[in-house]
């Protein structure tokens, strides 16, 4: 058993039929010695008396809020949560496996630049009685500070008869050095509590590996005289690291016809302009990627040829 926060404790249980469970001793936080009784949740049934209560925790029915009383007055509470281990593996019931980029990916994180600011998100089908707490650091043995905000519900999607909920959190490395080579990864730890179930999820990454620039901005077309060609121009996104001479992007320019089956013409360039043939009813799209490190491409910025 360990303390998650004040008066909230996590009991780690091997979860299998007829498992013996864990013996837990609760102590009433009071100077009183006599006349103390214990109850669980809203029940008025007295579970025991005395300053300590010894219980065998085997299942969710044994978890909950234990309260010690004296003469009708509440003295203190202890909330017991369960963390299930099945076949040696901690349960992952609360979050959905996003399966990207690989199986057992519960947390996904992205950064728009090298400032040390990043966003992580996760999915669940659970809509109520659910709390998240996020901690982060760079390195684990001698951790350097990363500050994370509160997790918030960022999207709700309908999947058949069920809804799926996306939560996200923003974190900022306290003393980020954008130009430095990373040697220790960022660690992100999410505590999830649904009713009386506790689970924890972790992700470890280098900022360079989770970079995904915003799409190029100010995408414009300039027709070239007496030609089917146009000059496409764009700018670095505002959120990208500066100076651009050091934090450079490379770009992919794509001409796509109205039909998805039509052949796509693609041009790769390090410049912020390119000349392409603009077909009728086609659209021109541009996306960006770090020039020197193959992390994710940005989403496309698009304009119609017409």
């Amino acid at each position: 058993i360990w303390e998650l926060k004040k008066d909230v404790y996590v009991v780690e249980l091997d979860w299998y039929p007829d498992a013996p469970g864990e013996m837990v001793v609760l102590t009433c936080d009071t100077p009183e010695e006599d006349g103390i009784t214990w109850t669980l949740d809203q029940s008025s049934e007295v579970l025991g008396s005395g300053k300590t209560l010894t219980i065998q925790v085997k299942e969710f029915g044994d978890a909950g809020q234990y309260t010690c009383h004296k003469g009708g007055e509440v003295l203190s509470h202890s909330l017991l949560l369960l963390h299930k281990k099945e076949d040696g593996i901690w349960s992952t019931d609360i979050l959905k496996d996003q399966k990207e980029p690989k199986n057992k990916t519960f947390l996904r994180c992205e950064a728009k630049n090298y400032s040390g600011r990043f966003t992580c998100w996760w999915l669940t089908t659970i809509s109520t009685d659910l709390t998240f707490s996020v901690k982060s650091s760079r390195g684990s043995s001698d951790p350097q500070g990363v500050t994370c905000g509160a997790a918030t519900l960022s999207a709700e999607r309908v999947r058949g008869d069920n809804k799926e909920y996306e939560y996200s959190v923003e974190c900022q490395e306290d003393s980020a050095c954008p130009a430095a080579e990373e040697s220790l990864p960022i660690e992100v730890m999410v505590d999830a509590v649904h009713k009386l179930k506790y689970e924890n999820y972790t992700s470890s990454f280098f900022i360079r590996d989770i970079i995904k620039p915003d799409p190029p901005k100010n995408l414009q077309l300039k027709p070239l005289k007496n030609s089917r060609q146009v000059e496409v121009s764009w700018e670095y996104p505002d959120t990208w690291s500066t100076p651009h001479s050091y934090f450079s992007l490379t770009f992919c320019v794509q001409v796509q016809g109205k039909s998805k089956r039509e052949k796509k013409d693609r041009v790769f360039t390090d410049k912020t302009s390119a000349t392409v043939i603009c077909r009728k009813n086609a659209s021109i799209s541009v996306r960006a990627q770090d020039r020197y490190y193959s992390s994710s491409w940005s989403e496309w910025a698009s304009v119609p040829c017409s």
């Epitope: 019931d93 089908t125 659970i126 809509s127 109520t128 009685d129």
Partner: antibody
Framework: SVEESGGRLVTPGTPLTLTCAVS????????MIWVRQAPGEGLEWIGI?????NTYYASWVKGRFTISKTSTTVDLKMISPTTEDTATYFC??????????????WGPGTLVTVSS | FELTQTPSSVEAAVEGTVTIKCQAS??????LSWYQQKPGQPPKLLIY???KLAPGVPSRFSGSGSGTQFTLTIGDLECADAATYYC???????????FGGGTEVVVV
């Protein structure tokens, strides 16, 4: 205690509001649920309203009902009733432990008949 | 999400025992309650958290199970136990909520 009212005979498409009046406890501490039971059938949950006023509906509801509350009442509005909505409608109070809760205080029910 | 109750009807003698099963289509941990309903009356809570007896309910009623399989057992049957019994999942309103189809208990 909780008590439903407002059930009556209505023609299809006529909106109807059922009211659940509560006494002896505050709605700010409990989830409330509306459940219905067609004649000779089982219990079917319609939706709940949490202590903070958030509403959640069964997937089949699809905008056919809305739940709201005041300090002492919980309303179920039937937007455009059909004959399939003929049932006894129950209001019940949760235990107070959770939003998705079990229900330990039930009203006697109010009968809604939808017929032309 | 589905809660399947079996059997739909059961007949048993006074002082006998009845067992009703409730199966969830996904794990709901122990977030299951049982209700008794008599004709013309609202449901009455018997069991919550799969196995905890509601206040004032005789100990002849007991609940067990977790995950997807749950059981309500009524021992030492009395005529007053003739009713329809429903299980209810309250895991989450989106990811596992609702009532089973009901089991009618006839006491002979």
């Amino acid at each position: 205690s909780v008590e439903e009212s407002g059930g009556r005979l209505v023609t299809p498409g006529t909106p109807l509001t059922l009211t659940c009046a509560v006494s002896g406890f505050s709605l700010s501490g409990y989830t409330m649920i509306w459940v219905r039971q067609a004649p000779g059938e089982g219990l079917e949950w319609i939706g709940i309203i949490s202590s903070s006023g958030n509403t959640y509906y069964a997937s089949w509801v699809k905008g056919r009902f809305t739940i709201s509350k005041t300090s002492t009442t919980v309303d179920l509005k039937m937007i455009s009733p059909t004959t399939e909505d003929t049932a006894t409608y129950f209001c019940a109070r949760g235990s107070g432990a959770y939003i998705s809760d079990y229900f330990n205080v039930w009203g006697p029910g109010t009968l809604v008949t939808v017929s032309s | 999400f589905e809660l399947t109750q079996t059997p739909s009807s059961v007949e048993a003698a006074v002082e006998g025992t009845v067992t009703i099963k409730c199966q969830a289509s996904q794990s709901i941990d122990s977030w299951l309650s049982w209700y008794q309903q008599k004709p013309g009356q609202p449901p009455k809570l018997l069991i919550y958290s799969a196995s905890k007896l509601a206040p004032g309910v005789p100990s002849r009623f007991s609940g067990s199970g977790s995950g997807t399989q749950f059981t309500l057992t009524i021992g030492d049957l009395e005529c007053a136990d003739a009713a329809t019994y429903y299980c209810q999942s309250y895991y989450d309103v989106n990811a596992g909520y609702g009532f089973g189809g009901g089991t009618e208990v006839v006491v002979v």
